[in-house]
């Protein structure tokens, strides 16, 4: 699997999940959160080749196609596959909630 | 939606499915299937900015870190959504066999 | 790379006020969280504050509600702690230190305040 | 306010042992605490953060451990240079307390 136990501890060059660090400040303007300052989000990248983690029958058609016309736009592209949730702390008025927001750590990588 | 009613009809600049027609032998070397010889596959092409059609929670935040940083390679990448099946002929020694290929044709797309 | 430069020892008398400051160099100053913390004599540390340069934000430990007041100067790279009021107890060790992924990454070298009549 | 509870208070130990120290929040941190190191007449020095990652430069002798409200660090084979005061910190809402040390 493209996960962070293998991407992390390789130097692989095809679709993989990539360390990635979001402050909610700098990054994003956000200032309603109030913990954590960022977290790690991490990312999706690297090529998709022919047979590289194909998520679907047309990802494997379009991989091909592209191997075939290595000038075309038209290529399979690495995007997340699991996702985490990230628990938060923020405020309403002066109370502290804790919250869980959904789909917010990459995992996984595939082609899609 | 970023489907082909939309997308087909405009020139939508941003994410969104574009026509592909893919013919088996040329662009796949596939000489099993008998019909069709190809058929329009379509893909999904296109940058994802902040609020354009954005899958997930971190879908969003990875657009607006973009937003922020825009020389950053870490950006969403427009994939398909909603996929087709598509009927095709090949042979068994001389017997023809009907079969739906799941996932083949892209008829929409979303920022992943 | 990161350094936090803090200034020299100071010595007050109770009921009085100390300013000290920390030279940031080497990270975006007004993109970090700078935190504040202290350690008296013998004893363990204690978190105080934090500020966020960029817009001056400021969270506070609510023990020195009232008494300490942080502030940042974007032009010089340069955050400041003033605490009032000094008693006894506030003797101790001053530290600058900024805020990274859930921790504070690099520390000022340390002002000691000594409060004395 | 969140409360720390390290132990033990003080331990002694020859080198080459394996060491565990212990932190317990009083709710759930989730991951967010760090472990600090420190000399006698020094600054902290941070080891670990969020809970399992080694900071740069720290021997891969030290680990973290843990989440929720139940937090180790581990010295895995104890050097005669790593006789220090050892402390833990939530940064799960302010204020970030510390551990009373160990």
């Known amino acids: 699997a493209l996960d962070t136990n293998y991407c992390f501890s390789s130097t692989e060059k095809n679709c993989c999940v990539r360390q990635l660090y979001i402050d909610f400040r700098k990054d994003l303007g956000w200032k309603w959160i109030h913990e954590p300052k960022g977290y790690h989000a991490n990312f999706c990248l690297g090529p998709c080749p022919y047979i590289w983690s194909l998520d679907t029958q047309y990802s494997k058609v379009l991989a091909l196609y592209n191997q075939h016309n290595p000038g075309a736009s038209a290529a399979p592209c690495c995007v997340p596959q699991a996702l985490e949730p990230l628990p938060i702390v923020y405020y309403v008025g002066r109370k502290p909630k804790v919250e869980q927001l959904s789909n917010m750590i990459v995992r996984s990588c595939k082609c899609s | 939606a970023l489907d082909t009613n939309y997308c087909f009809s405009s020139t939508e600049k941003n994410c969104c499915v574009r026509q592909l027609y893919i013919d088996f032998r040329k662009d796949l070397g596939w000489k099993w299937i008998h019909e069709p010889k190809g058929y329009h596959a379509n893909f999904c092409l296109g940058p994802c900015p902040y609020i354009w059609s954005l899958d997930t929670q971190y879908s969003k935040v990875l657009a607006l870190y973009n937003q922020h940083n825009p020389g950053a390679s870490a950006a969403p990448c427009c994939v398909p959504q909603a996929l087709e099946p598509l009927p095709i002929v090949y042979y068994v020694g001389r017997k023809p066999k009907v079969e739906q290929l799941s996932n083949m044709i892209v008829r929409s797309c979303k920022c992943s | 790379q990161v350094l936090l430069v803090q200034s020299g020892a100071e010595v007050r008398k109770p009921g009085a006020s100390v300013k000290i400051f920390c030279k940031a160099s080497g990270y975006s100053f007004t993109s970090s969280w700078m935190n504040w913390l202290r350690q008296a004599p013998e004893q363990g540390l204690e978190w105080m504050g934090q500020?966020?340069?960029?817009?001056?934000?400021?969270n506070y430990n609510g023990k020195f509600k009232g008494r300490l007041t942080l502030t940042a100067d974007t032009s010089t790279n340069t955050a400041y702690m003033e605490l009032s009021s000094l008693r006894s107890a506030d003797t101790a060790m001053y530290y600058c230190a900024r805020h990274y992924d859930g921790s504070t990454d690099y520390w000022g070298q340390g002002a000691l305040v000594t409060v004395s009549s | 306010e969140i409360q720390m509870t390290q132990s033990p208070s003080s331990l002694s130990a020859s080198p080459g042992d394996r060491v565990t120290i212990t932190c317990r929040a009083s709710e759930n941190i989730y991951s967010n605490l760090a472990w600090y190191q420190q000399k006698p007449g020094k600054v902290p020095k941070l080891l670990i953060y969020a809970a399992t990652n080694l900071a740069d430069g720290v021997p891969s002798r030290f680990s973290g451990s843990g989440s929720g409200t139940d937090f180790t660090l581990t010295i895995s084979s104890l050097e005669p240079e790593d006789a220090a005061t050892y402390y833990c910190?939530?940064?799960?809402?302010?204020?970030?307390?510390f551990g009373g040390g160990t």
């Open positions: 500020i966020y340069p960029g817009d001056g934000d400021t």
């Open positions: 910190q939530h940064f799960w809402g302010t204020p970030y307390t």
